[in-house]
């Protein structure tokens, strides 16, 4: 014959453990059931009475199977510099991202609490690590031999192109001009591009240096961290 | 060097104000998020506001909303905060804060202090 | 009363390990922010000593490490020094504050 199915509350056999979608409250000393994604627990369980759920208030959500006193609170609405990816449900938190030509300043477990704009890079000096989801663009001087000449977060120093006869020679922040006999080869035939998009933000004026410690893997974002830039100066 | 500076603090009255700067040098001024934190005597740290980089956003502690302003100029590489209807109990030093939100408060002034007191 | 919840001291002799605990709630630690640690020393600013969890910012030993599990936190310190007599405090971000926390601080004596 089949077990005869306990309607909850019920105590449970001495060893064993509660069914899915129920708890063991231990004040009572029964299995109770849990309450449903988007409600809370209202009236906990009792010997005599089961849990009395009720739906989550405004602005408020439960995900999961539970037996919380409160729902939990939706984050803050999402700044301009964000766009909302999930809505804030009685079921579900709000997701906020940055937008494109932006980086998560502030990462959550999910989505992101404060949004900066990917640095530039400003003439005579180069992207030396391009922007994440989670990091920022880090610049770097342009070394001997080599140029750029944009405001970018996406550009890269370029090698001066070689002349037969110098008219002008190249520094960090232009390329070399050769006489009207062109170029023997041009190592620059057009801007090297990074895959990120342009951004709005001023330029540090000298590089970020690495992390001196390895990427955290505390977040569901996909890059590692770049550390906070240290010895810029200001424009 | 990374050096933030603050000044500004002294004896004040309590309803009375008062105007903190923080001269920052060393960075990139305006790519950072900055922040206020006070620390009355003999206790703990305490968040006052926090400005955007480009100053379009301010947030504040509720001990002090409507009575304290954060601003910064980007031009001059300053922050600065406006204390008003000062009470005993914002007696604290002041320390002007870069935040780099993933990475910590990273760089701290040396702090001014604030006396509110008849 | 501080959002995050710290011991008001903790202490050890030279060379033992001491840990100290930053505990949390769904709208800080436990909403995934990251906690960072401070170090102040007497008469001193703050300064940065663990962030995002567990990392070190250049300069910090090894002897300090940091950890992070669903609403709390903690700090190690391994190898006692005198020079490490200070108070530590852990901070976040708080969605409900709308704004970083700091723990109420703990003041770590070295026997």
């Known amino acids: 014959l089949p077990a005869q199915v306990a309607f909850t509350p019920y105590a449970p056999e001495p060893g064993s453990t509660c069914r899915l979608r129920e708890y063991y409250d231990q004040t009572a000393q029964m299995c109770c059931s849990k309450c449903s994604p988007g409600q809370h627990a209202k009236v906990f369980c009792t010997k005599t009475s089961d849990t009395v759920c009720d739906s989550c208030e405004d602005s408020t959500y439960t995900q999961l199977w539970n037996w919380v006193p409160e729902c939990l609170s939706c984050g803050s609405r999402c700044s301009s510099d964000q766009v909302e990816t999930q809505a804030c449900t009685r079921e579900q938190n709000r997701i906020c991202t940055c937008r494109p030509g932006w980086y998560c300043a502030l990462s959550k477990q999910e989505g992101c609490r404060l949004c900066a704009p990917l640095r530039k890079c400003r003439p005579g000096f180069g992207v030396a690590r391009p922007g994440t989801e989670t990091s920022d663009v880090v610049c770097k001087p342009c070394a001997p031999g080599t140029f750029s000449n944009t405001t970018s977060s996406t550009d890269i120093c370029r090698p001066h192109q070689i002349c037969n006869v110098v008219a002008i020679p190249g520094n960090a922040s232009m390329d070399a001009v050769c006489t009207s006999t062109s170029p023997t080869r041009s190592m620059a035939p057009g801007a090297v591009h990074l895959p990120q998009p342009v951004s709005t933000r001023s330029q540090h004026t000298q590089p970020t240096p690495e992390p001196s410690t390895a990427p955290s893997t505390s977040f569901l974002l996909p890059m590692g961290p770049s550390p906070p830039a240290e010895g810029s100066t200001g424009d | 060097e990374v050096q933030l500076l603050e000044s500004g603090g002294g004896l004040v009255q309590p309803g009375g104000s008062l105007r903190l700067s923080c001269a920052a040098s060393g960075f990139t001024f305006s790519d950072y998020y900055m922040s206020w934190i006070r620390q009355a005597p003999g206790k703990g740290l305490e968040w006052v506001a926090l400005i955007w980089y480009d100053g379009g956003n301010e947030y504040y502690a509720d001990s002090v909303k409507g009575r304290f302003t954060i601003s910064r100029d980007n031009s001059k590489n300053t922050l600065y905060l406006q204390m008003n209807s000062l009470r005993a109990e914002d007696t604290a030093v002041y320390y002007c804060?870069?935040?780099?939100?993933?990475?910590?408060?990273?760089?701290w002034g040396q702090g001014t202090l604030v006396t509110v007191s008849s | 009363q501080s959002v995050l919840t710290q011991p008001p001291s903790a202490s050890g002799t030279p060379g033992q390990r001491v840990t100290i605990s930053c505990t949390g709630s769904?709208?800080?630690?436990?909403?995934?922010?990251?906690v960072h640690w401070y170090q102040q020393l007497p008469g001193t600013a703050p300064k940065l000593l663990i962030y995002r969890n567990n990392q070190r910012p250049s300069g910090v030993p090894d002897r300090f490490s940091g950890s992070k599990s669903g609403t709390s936190a903690s700090l190690a310190i391994s190898g006692l020094r005198s020079e490490d007599e200070a108070d530590y405090y852990c901070a976040t971000w708080d969605d409900r504050v709308n704004g970083p926390v700091f723990g109420g601080g703990t003041k770590l004596t070295v026997l």
């Open positions: 769904s709208s800080n630690i436990g909403a995934g922010y990251d």
């Open positions: 804060v870069r935040e780099t939100g993933n990475y910590g408060m990273d760089v």
